[in-house]
Interface confidence: low
């Protein structure tokens, strides 16, 4: 079956800046700002767009060692990000995958609302464990608040549109590490 859980949470950070840091550069930021929650993120394949597979590893002491995420959609205009947890963690005999949608919406006060949808695709008649949903929500909240704190402390970070130009790269826009580009373009 499919079990859908929807939540909303607010942030004082403007939507565009939060999307840039929390979504586009989360791979780099999470191990830095929340090492107690995420120990590393590695791009397994892809260039950051749909189809990209990432391995997120957790530090010792957490219930799971790792999960693998598949990027399904990155909408830079509407600050929307869809991805699915496809391996590791809770995925197994009873749970096939978790499809997640995050949309960041600007609020009049200059902050933002994160609208989050988590669809748990279970195998057969299995139900979703409440503690799993709770743990997942807590992890998301931990990461969000850690990134939020970082952005409040570093007022110049992720503010200006300072993407590296194609001219600088001698190639396409760079939104991921050189190794990841190499994986995508040369293999």
């Amino acid at each position: 079956g499919v079990f859908n859980y929807e939540t909303e949470t607010t942030s004082v950070i403007p939507a565009a800046r939060l999307f840039k840091a929390f979504i586009l550069d989360g791979d780099n930021l999470f191990p830095k700002v929340a090492p107690q929650a995420i120990s590393s993120v590695e791009n397994i394949e892809g260039n950051g767009g749909p189809g990209t597979i990432k391995k997120i590893s957790f530090p010792e002491g957490l219930p799971f060692k790792y999960v693998k995420d598949r990027v399904d959609e990155v909408d830079h205009t509407n600050f929307k990000y869809n991805y699915a947890v496809i391996e590791g963690g809770p995925i197994g005999d009873t749970l096939e995958k978790i499809s997640n949608e995050i949309k960041i919406v600007a609020t009049p006060d200059g902050g933002s609302i994160l609208k989050i949808s988590n669809k748990y695709h279970t195998k057969g008649d299995h139900e979703v464990k409440a503690e799993q949903v709770k743990a997942s929500k807590e992890m998301g909240e931990t990461l969000l608040r850690a990134v939020e704190s970082y952005l409040l402390a570093h007022s110049d970070a992720y503010n200006e549109q300072k993407l590296i130009s194609e001219e600088d790269l001698g190639g396409e826009q760079k939104l991921i590490s050189e190794e990841d580009l190499h994986h995508h373009h040369h293999h």
Partner: antibody, heavy 118, light 113 residues
Framework: QVQLVQSGAEVKKPGASVKVSCKTS????????ITWVRQAPGQGLEWMGW????????NYAQNVQGRVTMTTDTSTSTAYMEVRSLRSDDTAVYYC???????????WGQGTLVTVSS | DIVMTQSPDSLAVSLGERATINCKSS????????????LAWFQQKPGQPPKLLIY???TRESGVPDRFSGSGSGTDFTLTISSLQAEDVAVYYC?????????FGQGTKLEIK
């Protein structure tokens, strides 16, 4: 703590091959790539390439492409770099290094001196 | 390739005085959509591997004395040792890790005057 321990010094003749090992410990080997850097006597640091310990993907510097092969053995958490068709200007200390989650070169092996001499 | 050029090639500074080493990159070393400059500074003493001092141009690595500081952005970067100590005698390298090949500066040899 994170440690990278490299194999001992080697003396090779021109045209021969050398394989340097880098045994890692203190972290999950497959979560981080391994970079190789060399330093000729009295010279600066030269990046040689990188290998993903997760899937073996590689990225070699242009000047060593074709003569260098980087591999890993996940069962022993060890990275290897082989240099073929050695020349005298390959005489150098070879270092392995592990990047941090933030991508900088944080942890280094102690270095392996490779001397190429007839 | 991004070319990293350090100046000066060698530097002699009195104990307790300030030492400044410059590094210029041929291209910006900004990474992704953040404002982080992917530039590191290393210290290397004879017979030892390089030791990371600074990353992101200005963030001190854990355990590095606070007399070491990094600054700069764009293409111009500086490593400053506010009060030179005897154990700071070494060769210092800047390195960009934004775009492969990850290039190093040619090194600056720091000595005591």
């Amino acid at each position: 703590q994170v440690q990278l321990v490299q194999s001992g010094a080697e003396v090779k003749k021109p045209g021969a091959s050398v394989k340097v090992s880098c045994k890692t410990s203190g972290y999950t080997f497959t979560n981080y790539g391994i970079t190789w850097v060399r330093q000729a006597p009295g010279q600066g640091l030269e990046w040689m390439g990188w290998i993903s310990a997760y899937n073996g993907n590689t990225n070699y510097a242009q000047n060593v492409q074709g003569r260098v092969t980087m591999t890993t053995d996940t069962s022993t958490s060890t990275a290897y770099m082989e240099v073929r068709s050695l020349r005298s200007d390959d005489t150098a200390v070879y270092y392995c290094a592990r990047r941090s989650s933030m991508l900088h070169f944080q942890h280094w092996g102690q270095g392996t001196l490779v001397t190429v001499s007839s | 390739d991004i070319v990293m050029t350090q100046s000066p090639d060698s530097l002699a500074v009195s104990l307790g005085e300030r030492a400044t080493i410059n590094c210029k990159s041929s291209q910006h070393v900004l990474y992704d959509s953040s404002n982080e400059n992917y530039l590191a500074w290393f210290q290397q003493k004879p017979g030892q591997p390089p030791k990371l001092l600074i990353y992101w141009a200005s963030t001190r690595e854990s355990g590095v004395p606070d007399r070491f500081s990094g600054s700069g952005s764009g293409t111009d970067f500086t490593l400053t040792i506010s009060s030179l100590q005897a154990e700071d005698v070494a060769v210092y390298y800047c390195q960009q890790y934004s775009s492969a090949p990850y290039t190093f500066g040619q090194g600056t040899k720091l000595e005591i005057k």
